[in-house]
Interface confidence: low
């Protein structure tokens, strides 16, 4: 509003007095002085209060104050005229925009408020004080319109594994004044940054560059913007995505022999990692898959194996960025054809080592049972040499026997027992390979000693055949069994040195 | 402020598929990710899936994989959640979640909706 | 999976933690829900941001695979069932919440 308006509201008496007051202290030290800020800070769309206060002595008054801005380079522009008598007057330029802050008002505050400071509203003001009876009193102050910046962030092209110094992302912010755009991230990259200055603002462009790789993904890069007119810094958080694909294995096949026919719930899964996530694709190398093989996904179930789910198997994984394969050979096994496989290490060494033992025993069986039979043999030889001998002498020691009462019945047990543990049938063996030790009693009879020692070694060598020999060979074995003997009153005694005698086939003793 | 409202809940037949729509109101909607987390009744909270501000990448909780397909409109600041084949254990109350940044993480929800009952019964 | 107690108490005054553990997590975000079918209300995201209209006494934080939330002069409003959450990064399909650890205000 323009002074004038103030002045004819104020009326010709008054504004005459206050002109011959204003004159005649101008060019004097003031009484007051004006209080006010250099500059007023206001963010966009808050309100910003334009102080003014004038600070004089008692009983001095304001009149008036008038707000107007005087950017340099262009003329003053009025915003308002504060009257003490007729209150605010706004100029059409900010009507609705300017207000008195509200009460309790101090008449000699002459403050204002400019509602929902806009960026244009940025400039410089000038508070004009008309006071009673000091006179009038100026001051300018400037206001600053912060803008809080918009950051936006852009993700830079696609990240793949094996890139060289990628764009990652980039941060825009615009504000006025310019805007601090910095990266907070645990990744390492490079970062470059550019401004753009507008007419009333600046823009501020970040870049952040890295070199991808798969440790990187799912890690935030946060775009940090700092301003004066932000309360607290504002944080625009982008999750890096790396493209890449893990080479491919199979698992299942760890223990060849769980793969035998019969066996259930037998399958083959495919590892791998990729992003973006990878899908999976079963093949047979030599032929279709098998009917009743599953596929789900990763995994190849397979029913109850047989032998035509035998083959090679691959897995083929692949995602947008590339693709793997890995392939299995599946051998079924028989358990009837390969349970000679499954014995394991000991009982295979037990099974040789016994069936060694078995063939060196049997070996020692047939070496004794081979001896054994040669020294029988040998035995028959001299029993029927020394029958022969003692032919002549059967009768007079059968008389002689009779003589002297002894009856083979008579015997003592001891002698029964010898004779039965002594011969051949009774010697009864349950294992297969029996050794009978024949040696000491049974061959080498160095002296005769007693009857009953005859008696036993006659029963055991006796043979039951060979009369014809006998006959034949009679008169030489008469002569050589005569060596053996002394003949004494009508019998005949063993000489001390003689070999075994053996006497009648049928166990009489003499 | 931030709002979240969800809309197509209700009663359900089970083998049967379930459309839920949120929209989003006081943010700039493509800017961030977005989730849906449900409820069981007496349980605790559980992670349906989520969208990427850009709507060009999707995850789905373990649960729903293979039944479920989340969508976004960035111009009408909507998201969907399609859930087919429905079952007596997706019963509960689904919430539309906005994450603080431009993924769908668990981690870093700051704003929810109210929720929306969902009854899957014959 | 993720892990955490089924259960905590404190006084009002008192300093209480709750901890959610994970094999890969490297961000936890912490959930206040008062009564079940109530919604979530956030108090921690991306391990230790907290929204601007939770109290001070909220805080989050991270050491090795395990988040904790402190709540420092827990109050009686305080008390509510607490869920973590996680994304793992290592899958892209793994965003996983905890059990709930109910808060007991004694």
């Known amino acids: 509003m323009p002074l004038s308006l103030g002045a004819e509201m104020w009326g010709p008496e008054a504004w005459l007095l206050l002109l011959l007051l204003l004159a005649s202290f101008t060019g004097r030290c003031p009484a007051g002085e004006l209080e006010t800020s250099d500059v007023v800070t206001v963010v966009l769309g808050q309100d910003a209060k334009l102080p003014c206060f004038y600070r004089g002595d008692s009983g001095e008054q304001v009149g008036q104050v008038a707000w107007a801005r005087v950017d340099a380079g262009e003329g003053a522009q009025e915003l308002a005229l504060l009257h003490s008598k007729y209150g605010l007057h706004v100029s059409p330029a900010y009507e609705g925009r300017v207000e008195q802050p509200p009460p309790p008002r101090n008449p000699l505050d002459g403050s204002v408020l400019l509602r929902n400071a806009v960026q244009a509203d940025e400039g410089e003001y000038e508070c004009r004080v008309s006071t009673f009876p000091a006179g009038s009193f100026q001051a300018r102050l400037r206001l600053r319109v912060l803008v809080p910046p918009l950051p936006s962030l852009n993700p830079g092209p696609a990240l793949e594994e094996g890139q060289g110094l990628t764009l990652a992302a980039s941060c825009t912010a615009e504000g006025s004044p310019a805007p601090s755009v910095t990266w907070d991230t645990e990744v390492k990259g490079t970062t470059s940054s550019r401004s753009f200055k507008h007419s009333r603002s600046a823009a501020v462009t970040s870049e952040f560059h890295l070199v991808p790789s798969r440790s990187m993904n799912g890690q935030p890069l946060t775009c940090v913007v700092s301003h004066p007119g932000l309360l607290q810094d504002q944080r625009i958080t982008h999750i890096l995505h790396v493209s890449f694909l893990a080479e491919a294995s199979v698992r299942g096949l760890e223990d060849q022999n769980l793969w035998h026919i019969g066996r259930e719930g037998a399958m083959l899964k495919c590892l791998s990692e990729g992003q973006p996530p990878p899908s999976y694709n079963w093949t047979r190398l030599d032929g279709p898959l098998p009917s009743g093989v599953r596929v789900d996904g990763d995994t190849l179930g397979f029913p109850p194996l047989t032998t035509e789910h035998s083959g090679i198997y691959v897995c083929h994984v692949s995602n947008e960025f590339s693709s793997r394969d890995s392939q299995v050979t599946v051998d079924v096994l028989d358990p009837q054809e390969d349970s000679g496989k499954q014995v394991d290490l000991v009982s295979a060494s037990v099974v040789v080592v016994g069936v060694i033992a078995a063939l060196l025993f049997c070996l020692l069986v047939v070496v004794v049972v081979l001896m054994s039979r040669y020294h029988r043999r040998k035995a028959q030889q001299m029993t029927q040499k020394y029958e022969e001998e003692l032919t002549l002498t059967r009768e007079n020691s059968i008389r002689r026997l009779h003589s002297h009462h002894t009856d083979p019945r008579s015997q003592p047990e001891e002698s029964v027992g010898l004779r039965a543990e002594g011969h051949p049938d009774s010697l009864k063996d349950n294992s297969s390979c029996s050794v009978m030790s024949e040696e000491p009693e049974g061959r080498s009879y160095s002296t005769l000693t007693t009857v009953r020692e005859i008696e036993t070694q006659t029963e055991l060598l006796s043979p039951g055949s060979g009369r014809a020999e006998e006959e034949e060979d009679q008169d030489e074995g008469i002569k050589q069994a005569m060596n053996h003997f002394v003949q004494e009153n009508g019998t005949l005694r063993a000489k001390p040195t003689g070999n075994g005698i053996y006497i009648n086939g049928r166990g009489h003793l003499v | 402020t931030v709002t979240l409202d969800e809309s197509g809940g209700g009663l359900q037949t089970p083998g049967g598929g379930l459309s839920l729509v949120c929209k989003g109101s006081?943010?700039?909607?493509?800017?961030?990710?977005m989730a849906w987390v449900r409820q069981a009744p007496g349980k605790g909270l559980e992670f349906v899936g989520g969208?990427?501000?850009?709507?060009?990448?999707?995850g789905y909780g373990a649960a729903v994989k293979g039944r479920a397909t989340i969508s976004r409109d960035n111009g009408q600041s909507t998201v969907r959640l399609q859930l087919n084949d429905l079952r007596a254990e997706d019963t509960g109350t689904y919430y539309c979640?906005?994450?603080?940044?431009?993924?769908?993480?668990?981690?870093?929800?700051?704003?929810w909706g109210h929720g929306t009952e969902v009854i899957v019964s014959s | 999976a993720l892990t955490q107690p089924s259960s905590v108490s404190a006084n009002p005054g008192e300093t209480v933690e709750v901890t959610c553990s994970g094999d890969?997590?490297?961000?936890y975000g912490w959930y206040q829900q008062k009564s079940p079918g109530s919604a979530p209300v956030t108090v921690i995201?991306?391990?230790?941001k907290r929204p601007s209209d939770i109290p001070s006494r909220f805080s989050g934080s991270k050491s090795g695979s395990t988040g904790t939330l402190t709540i420092t002069g827990v109050q009686a409003e305080d008390e509510a069932v607490y869920f973590c959450?996680?994304?793992?990064?290592?899958?892209?399909?793994?965003?996983?919440f905890g059990a709930g650890t109910t808060l007991t205000v004694l």
């Open positions: 006081g943010f700039t909607f493509s800017s961030n990710g």
């Open positions: 969208v990427n501000a850009a709507g060009s990448w999707t």
């Open positions: 959450g996680a994304y793992d990064s290592t899958t892209h399909s793994g965003s996983a």
């Open positions: 890969d997590s490297r961000y």
């Open positions: 979640a906005k994450t603080a940044d431009d993924w769908y993480g668990a981690d870093d929800i700051d704003a």
């Open positions: 995201y991306y391990n230790d």
